[in-house]
Interface confidence: low
């Protein structure tokens, strides 16, 4: 081992704490970059809120037309009776037979009640029912008074939280400009450096200690910072785990419809099955039965019904959509929140260490190149460090960086911030 | 966007064991099952089998049993497919497969395949 | 076991042209048939299923039809992109199994 005098130990440690000193102001212009950010990312969803918006609007003239179109068929007399009685006979089996099938295949749970639920469902429903669509018109409100559930909900908490993180953003710690961070505090004590945090601010101008020698109590300037963000996380993070948010329409939409959504359906009221009609013969032949001859004005309707049921169907996906890219906005803001508190809480720990009385952020204890005879691998350098308030860190550096090398503290340095940084996010 | 990201190839030894991995984003892992597809050498497709994330319970073709074993890891969103006693014959690219629980959805995702190459 | 039988092995057609596939299964298969395109070196990609339901995306020029144990799938105006396999799937079963291909190429 090469013995390495006081003199270069205090030159390491000098290098080592400029390295540790710029990573700091790093930490502290990431917090901006996040802020950014956020910004950029609230700017897109408040976009994406007015297309939404507009697309809702669209969906319900559509919903509106549909149900006007429904309701003056319904005020019809029934036509086509015994044709259309016929094939409903034929049509429930198959529908039956083919629920069932699914009913057992997939929501896996009982069957027998359902069966008997499903032969009442039948039993009661008109094939008038079938005939004008009133299973995809069902569905399309059922559909629309979710979405509109949704929206409400991540508005709520996306305002909650927008409130919180504008009151956040409003300190002068993120209104003060880059070339400000350095900051010498009027009250710090001698022999230190300049600083990145600002006592101008709201947070910690209130906070200001009475005597100049008092140690300055970082954690508890940045304590309401972090809180902030805690709230603005915990108003983002509610709707994910609200009920409505369990299996939403747009997590991973599909042109089928969702397997639970259908189970629900089915064992709920049997609706379910109605979606299957696709899959019978006799139950398609019901819905292209022409009663044109017996009376032109229900053909006419029933056309004007088919168009409009299809816009609206058309109109929902959309909205969907657009729902679901919003959804999107949303977690990723609540992501972004979730970086901002780590690397506040970073922030704050090291504005906290660096009032420490040693003038190094990092010190250097001892250096020893190894031999081809130790237990190390040969031409590695093994350096042990004091970080801050931290126990000794002991860093190996690969033989391709020598000592002699400008790189050589700054691996060391790195590397020492990574461990400490790991062994406080494992407290 | 839902994706299905594979390992890289695989260069194995006869009677040697592999494991393949098959990372899942973009949607809700557990709600939907993932199977596994065998073709060899640009010959037709194979099912080997499916395993539905949510019990974390497999099924397999036959041919495949005892040949195959079907994982997930659900904190990572990653099923896992381990080949043993390798031959010359399982040689091939491997797929995973994304299909709803409805019998009306067939495998709409497929991740972009394994090539597995037994040689001594 | 269901056996998917699928012809022609290859075929070859003109631009702008109409290409047909069948897909015979050993027994009822329901309409749960679905058919892929693949091309070397991706994954396969669903273009239908269910028999005739197109996947989102892709263009009203692919159709299929069919029922029982009979099934087929066609390209209309067929386009340079279209070169590809491609494989009807039964997935009535939960041993699902594929047709044996049908490779297109362009005159």
């Known amino acids: 081992d090469q013995t390495v005098s006081d003199n270069e130990l205090q030159e390491m440690s000098n290098q080592g704490s400029k390295y540790v000193n710029k990573e700091i102001q790093n930490a502290v212009n990431g917090v901006k970059q996040i802020k950014t950010l956020i910004e950029k990312t609230n700017e897109e969803r408040k976009t994406l809120l007015s297309n939404l918006e507009e697309a809702k609007k669209k969906k319900e003239d559509a919903l509106n037309e549909t149900r006007e179109s429904e309701t003056k068929l319904k005020e019809l007399p029934g036509v086509c009776n015994e044709t259309m009685m016929a094939l409903w006979e034929e049509c429930k089996p198959c529908l039956k037979q083919t629920c069932m099938k699914f009913y057992a295949r997939v929501c896996r749970s009982g069957s027998g009640l359902v069966g008997r639920q499903l032969e009442e469902f039948l039993n009661q429903s008109s094939p008038f029912y079938f005939w004008m669509n009133g299973d995809r018109i069902d569905s399309l409100l059922e559909n629309d008074r979710q979405q509109t559930h949704m929206l409400d909900v991540m508005q709520d908490h996306f305002s909650r939280a927008s409130s919180i993180i504008d009151e956040l953003f409003q300190d002068r710690f993120f209104t003060r400009e880059p070339q400000d961070t350095y900051h010498y505090l009027p009250f710090s004590l001698p022999h230190r450096r300049p600083h990145f945090f600002f006592p101008k601010s709201r947070i910690v101008r209130s906070l200001m200690p009475f005597s100049p020698y008092e140690p300055l109590n970082f954690h508890a300037m940045f304590q309401p910072f972090l809180e902030m963000i805690h709230e603005a996380q915990q108003a983002m993070d509610i709707h994910f785990h609200s009920p409505a948010f369990q299996h939403p329409p747009t997590e991973f939409i599909r042109e089928g419809d969702d397997d639970r959504t259908v189970c629900r359906e089915i064992r709920h009221n049997s609706t379910g099955c109605l979606r299957m009609k696709d899959q019978c013969d006799k139950c398609r032949e019901i819905l292209s039965v022409d009663c044109s001859t017996n009376n032109p004005s229900q053909a006419k309707l029933r056309r004007e019904l088919d168009e409009s049921l299809q816009v609206a169907e058309r109109l929902t996906r959309k909205y969907n959509e657009l729902l679901k890219s919003y959804q999107w906005k949303m977690l990723n803001t609540s992501s972004l929140l979730e970086q901002l508190n780590e690397q506040f809480n970073w922030v704050s720990r090291l504005a906290n260490l660096t009032q420490g009385e040693d003038q190094y952020y990092l010190r250097v204890t001892t250096v020893a190149s190894h031999t081809s005879d130790s237990d190390v691998p040969s031409g590695v350098t093994e350096v042990v460090v004091k970080l801050f308030d931290s126990d000794p860190i002991t860093v190996t550096v690969p033989v391709e960086v020598s000592r002699k090398n400008p790189k050589f503290m700054e691996t060391v340095a790195e590397k020492a911030l990574q461990e400490y940084r790991k062994k406080h996010r494992e407290e | 966007e839902v994706q299905l990201q594979q390992s890289g190839p695989e260069l194995e030894k006869p009677g040697a064991s592999v494991k393949i991995s098959c990372k899942a984003s973009?949607?809700?892992?557990?709600?939907?099952?993932m199977n596994w597809v065998k073709q060899n050498n640009g010959k037709s497709l194979e099912w080997i089998g499916n395993?539905?994330?949510?019990?974390?319970?497999?099924n397999y073709n036959q041919k495949f049993k005892g040949k195959a074993t079907l994982t997930v890891d659900k904190s990572s969103s990653t099923a896992y497919m381990q080949l043993k006693s390798l031959t010359s014959e399982d040689s091939a690219v491997y797929y995973c497969?994304?299909?709803?629980?409805?019998?009306?959805?067939?495998?709409?995702?497929w991740g972009q395949g394994t090539s597995v190459t037994v040689s001594s | 076991d269901i056996q998917m039988t699928q012809s022609p092995s290859s075929l070859s057609a003109s631009l702008g042209g109409k290409v047909t596939i069948t897909c015979k299964a050993s027994?009822?298969?329901?309409?749960?048939i679905a058919w892929y395109q693949h091309k070397p070196g991706k994954g396969p990609r669903l273009l239908i299923h269910?028999?005739?339901t197109l996947q989102p995306g892709i263009p009203s020029r692919f159709s299929g039809s069919g029922s029982g144990r009979d099934y087929s799938f066609s390209i209309s105006n067929l386009e340079p992109e279209d070169i590809a396999t491609y494989y009807c799937?039964?997935?009535?079963?939960?041993?699902?199994?594929f047709g044996g291909g049908t490779k297109l190429e362009i005159k």
């Open positions: 497969a994304l299909n709803s629980l409805l019998r009306l959805n067939a495998m709409d995702y």
């Open positions: 973009g949607y809700s892992f557990t709600g939907y099952n």
């Open positions: 395993i539905d994330p949510y019990y974390g319970t497999p």
């Open positions: 027994q009822d298969i329901n309409k749960y």
């Open positions: 269910y028999t005739s």
């Open positions: 799937l039964q997935y009535d079963n939960l041993l699902r199994t």
